[in-house]
């Protein structure tokens, strides 16, 4: 090999041993019989050599470092080549560095010809193996501006006071030019402007100058956007820190075309804007930072770019101010990570602030848009609370348990409505009562209905679950002792449709003690399956449910259970169950945690059964399932 | 604008079978569920049931399970009613009317179609 | 199912009058009520729903009240194109049904 370097080039070459590795067999550079481990070469300097091995890429790297002085002559502005030819050189892994020294008014641009640059983050590595890392000075201080790849947005980056521009090319890759030329510009008076362009739909992260190390103090960076007028753009930061400010404000600050308020002034643990339309400019402010405890400012960030969709130029009005205790979420539904390009989905409050997260709350007006390619990706999640405090007001009282149709006008799904609904202690109980009876869910008898009411205590310390309920059964009422939560939870679109002729009411009633009363009125044609509340996890220790039967005159109840015993082991108190005629009162008792269960039973007229567990011991819980089955009576027994 | 658009009166004969259409335009119809209701010659208004235009499930009154059958043709913002085997107490105007979204509003029949006279006569 | 009542098959009020019409449900239907006007040869249109709300576009004279099992319809100050049918309906749970109607004559 033989590598010339011209007089006043200004060039250093320097071959020298890579990372070592476990090879068994040395490799040397040759030159006239001498065998060494590094070689420099210098302007002017012409020199021969080979390698003592087949492989020298395994052992050496070769570095070609350019300086440019912009000091104290004219800058050689324009594109930048790559001086010696990758021709002429040993296929060696070869970094080429151009250090450009000039002064603090004078601005350098690189400019970068596609492909643009995407910025890596730290521990992430190019496909291809090409690099290119880009630092600046302030000072007498190296600053790194970041580590970047081929294929992405960035196509200038702005400097002032030097700039020096690392380009590794692995040995194997064919690549002859720099793919970047230098420009002057006047002063940026900050440390850097990174301009990114957006040809169409695309994602590009970005991060401080040193992330992840701090970002220099009390400087300035700024984000410069391309962003084509029809696509939309959406700013996520991944991660942030802040110093510890003596003086000033760490903040972002964000130009955007349109706005009246620019620039306009972010914190960084703010949302930050979202849907904006075409180019727009983001600022990153350090400050002062305390002496003692520095700290450190860095941030790696996001930008979305999108088609808007026709969901994004509506405006929808969501009055809540008419609403008391309320909060409504809509959210990105769970779904499985995809690994290609997804474009974001957010919900956006007055057009601006979006997010993938958003939840109103009750007693204003709000304005939400949409700025996403698929709103099935997103669902609604509402609570709302509706307490009585004074016994004396509420009692009898009722209220529709009914979606407001400003939820349901949203263009998003509805996923849980959840009415929590609280009583004072001891003083009132709760009655539901639904427009069409409901049918309890069990295996036996599954729910296919679009939307369920999910009914569970409310009580913090209880782990009480009543089951969940479909219109088209035989439940006529549900009496709970305190404090439950009814959630309708749908399960198809079409549901809004359904639920709109399913009303469901509670009222506050006189206070009783038992857990849960169950008002069943079976109809002929059908057998009504009833299970006990928290199901596979047992019914809570000390807790009583019952379940009044009505069987309408001409007809016989079949009740049948569908174990022979229950399965419930006692630590302390007795499990057990009454089955009472309602008219004669006439009684029958079972000790659940000794005695079978009762075989098939016929009733001629209404009844109860009440199940009154002990304290079980683990893993013996008490589960029961039964049933209910009319048949038209075949003698007047009366 | 909201409107229910039905097609026009009818004459039939005993047994025979009649379809009655309805259509929607002013929203979108797959929203919002379509309700039939009879009313006799001198009486009052009797609900016939319902059809799901999202799913295509179709509810029946008691009285109204057996000759009657609600279908839709989606694309096209309509909905069926067709009556088989008519008799003579199928002579009555039937009307479809949409209802809303509101709590338990899809009961409440805020849109009415102009209403299709069927006379059954032999 | 439920039934509704109309206790008043008919009224004969004059023009300018205030006149109530009741509806009675055999049980409870939660203010799940609504009222209609039927006038001759025309379809039915939508006065009050939920007991009390105003449908759009419904002179402020009409006004609904009641809860539980009584509700009624009150028209203040009758027009003449007030005259005509009234209809209550349950919609609390199917099916819906009618009430036998009301109708409202000129003196």
């Known amino acids: 090999f033989e590598i010339a370097l011209p007089r006043e080039s200004n060039i250093t070459v320097l071959i020298k041993l890579g990372t070592p590795t476990l090879l068994a067999k040395p490799c040397y550079i040759v030159i006239s019989k001498r065998h060494i481990t590094m070689l420099s070469i210098k302007s002017g300097e012409r020199i021969v050599f080979t390698f003592s091995c087949q492989s020298p890429e395994n052992h050496f790297v070769i570095e070609i470092q350019k300086n440019i002085d912009c000091m104290s002559g004219p800058c050689p502005f324009g594109e930048v080549q790559l001086q010696p030819s990758t021709s002429l050189l040993p296929t060696l892994n070869r970094t080429f560095i151009w250090d450009v020294k000039a002064h603090k008014s004078i601005g350098l641009e690189l400019q970068f010809s596609i492909p643009r640059l995407r910025q890596i983050g730290p521990g992430e590595s190019c496909p291809d193996g090409v690099t290119h890392s880009i630092s600046g000075r302030i000072d007498a201080t190296v600053v790194r501006i970041g580590t970047f790849c081929s294929n992405g947005t960035v196509s200038r980056i702005k400097m002032q006071e030097g700039v020096k521009m690392a380009l590794h090319l692995p040995w194997f890759h064919p690549r002859n030019v720099s793919g970047f030329s230098i420009a002057n510009r006047s002063s940026i008076k900050r440390l850097c402007i990174i301009e990114s362009v957006f040809e169409g739909e695309g994602s590009a992260t970005l991060m401080s100058a040193n992330y992840p190390e701090g970002f220099p103090e009390d400087e300035l960076m700024t984000w410069q956007f391309v962003v084509p007028a029809h696509l939309r753009a959406s700013v996520s930061f991944l991660n942030f820190n802040l110093s510890n400010c003596e003086r000033k404000e760490e903040r972002v600050e964000y130009y955007i075309p349109g706005s009246t308020t620019n620039p306009e002034v972010f914190k960084l643990e703010d949302k930050q804007p979202g849907n904006m339309a075409g180019n727009f400019n983001l600022s990153l402010q350090g400050c002062d930072q305390d002496a003692q405890s520095p700290g450190i400012l860095r941030l790696q960030f996001q930008v979305l770019v999108q088609h808007p969709q026709n969901e994004s130029n509506k405006i929808y009005v969501v009055d809540l101010s008419n609403e008391r205790a309320m909060s409504l979420t809509i959210e990105p539904r769970p779904v499985k990570q995809s690994r290609k390009f997804v474009p974001g989905c957010f919900v956006c409050l007055e057009s601006r602030t979006c997010s993938s997260n958003l939840t109103l709350t009750s007693g204003s007006k709000h304005k939400i848009s949409f700025l996403c390619d698929d709103l099935t990706r997103l669902w609604m999640n509402v609570e709302k609370t509706i307490s009585c405090t004074d016994h004396r007001y509420c009692q009898r009282k009722s209220y529709s348990l009914q979606v407001p149709s400003d939820i349901l006008h949203l263009p998003v799904e509805l996923h849980d409505f959840s009415w929590k609904l609280l009583v004072p202690k001891d003083r009132l109980s709760l009655v539901l009562v639904p427009a069409q009876k409901l049918q309890q869910h069990t295996h036996e008898k599954p729910c296919n209905t679009s939307f369920s009411y999910l009914v569970a205590s409310a009580i913090p310390s209880q782990d009480l679950y009543f089951g969940s309920f479909c219109p088209g059964g035989s439940i006529k009422q549900i009496q709970v002792k305190q404090n439950i939560s009814v959630t309708l939870r749908t399960f198809a679109p079409s549901f809004q449709q359904e639920a709109s002729r399913q009303g469901l009411t509670v009222s506050f009633i006189p206070y009783f003690k038992e857990e849960g009363v169950f008002t069943v009125t079976p109809d002929t044609k059908s057998k009504v399956y009833l299970r006990t509340p928290n199901w596979d996890r047992g019914l809570p220790s000390l807790t009583s449910v019952s379940w009044n039967i009505s069987v309408p005159r001409d007809q016989v109840a079949c009740l049948t259970f569908f174990k022979e015993r229950s399965g419930v082991v006692c630590q302390t108190g007795r499990a057990f169950m009454i089955i009472q005629e309602q008219r004669t009162r006439a009684e029958e008792i079972f000790s659940l945690d000794e005695d079978v269960l009762p075989k098939p039973s016929f009733h001629h007229h209404s009844f109860w059964v009440n199940i009154s567990n002990c304290s079980p011991t683990s893993g013996k819980q008490l589960d029961l399932l039964f049933s209910v089955t009319l048949t038209p009576r075949t003698v007047d027994l009366t | 604008e909201v409107t229910l658009k039905e097609s026009g009166p009818e004459l039939k004969k005993p047994g025979e079978t009649v379809k009655i259409s309805c259509k929607a335009s002013?929203?979108?119809?797959?929203?919002?569920?379509m309700n039939w209701v009879k009313q006799a010659p001198g009486k009052d208004l009797k609900f016939m049931g319902w059809i799901n235009t999202y799913t295509g499930e179709a509810t029946y009154a008691d009285d109204f399970k057996g000759r009657f059958d609600f279908s839709l043709e989606a694309s096209a913002s309509t909905a069926f009613l067709r009556i088989n085997n008519l008799k003579n107490e199928d002579t009555a105007t039937y009307f479809c009317?949409?209802?809303?979204?509101?709590?338990?509003?899809?009961?409440?029949?805020?849109?009415w179609g102009q209403g299709t006279t069927v006379t059954v006569s032999s | 199912d439920i039934v509704m009542t109309q206790a008043a098959a008919s009224l004969s009020v004059t023009v300018g009058e205030t006149v109530t019409i009741t509806c009675r449900a055999s049980?409870?239907?939660?203010?799940?009520l609504a009222w209609y006007q039927q006038q001759q040869g025309k379809s039915p249109q939508l006065l009050v729903y939920?007991?009390?709300n105003l449908a759009d576009g419904v002179p402020s004279r009409f006004s609904g009240s009641g809860s539980g099992t009584h509700y009624s319809l009150k028209i203040n100050s009758l027009q003449s194109e007030d005259f005509g049918f009234y209809y209550c309906?349950?919609?609390?749970?199917?099916?819906?049904?009618f009430g036998g109607g009301t109708k409202l004559e000129i003196k």
């Open positions: 309906q349950h919609f609390w749970g199917t099916p819906p049904t």
């Open positions: 049980e409870n239907i939660y203010n799940n």
């Open positions: 002013g929203y979108a119809f797959t929203k919002y569920g």
């Open positions: 939920a007991a009390t």
């Open positions: 009317s949409r209802g809303d979204d509101y709590g338990t509003g899809g009961y409440v029949l805020f849109y």
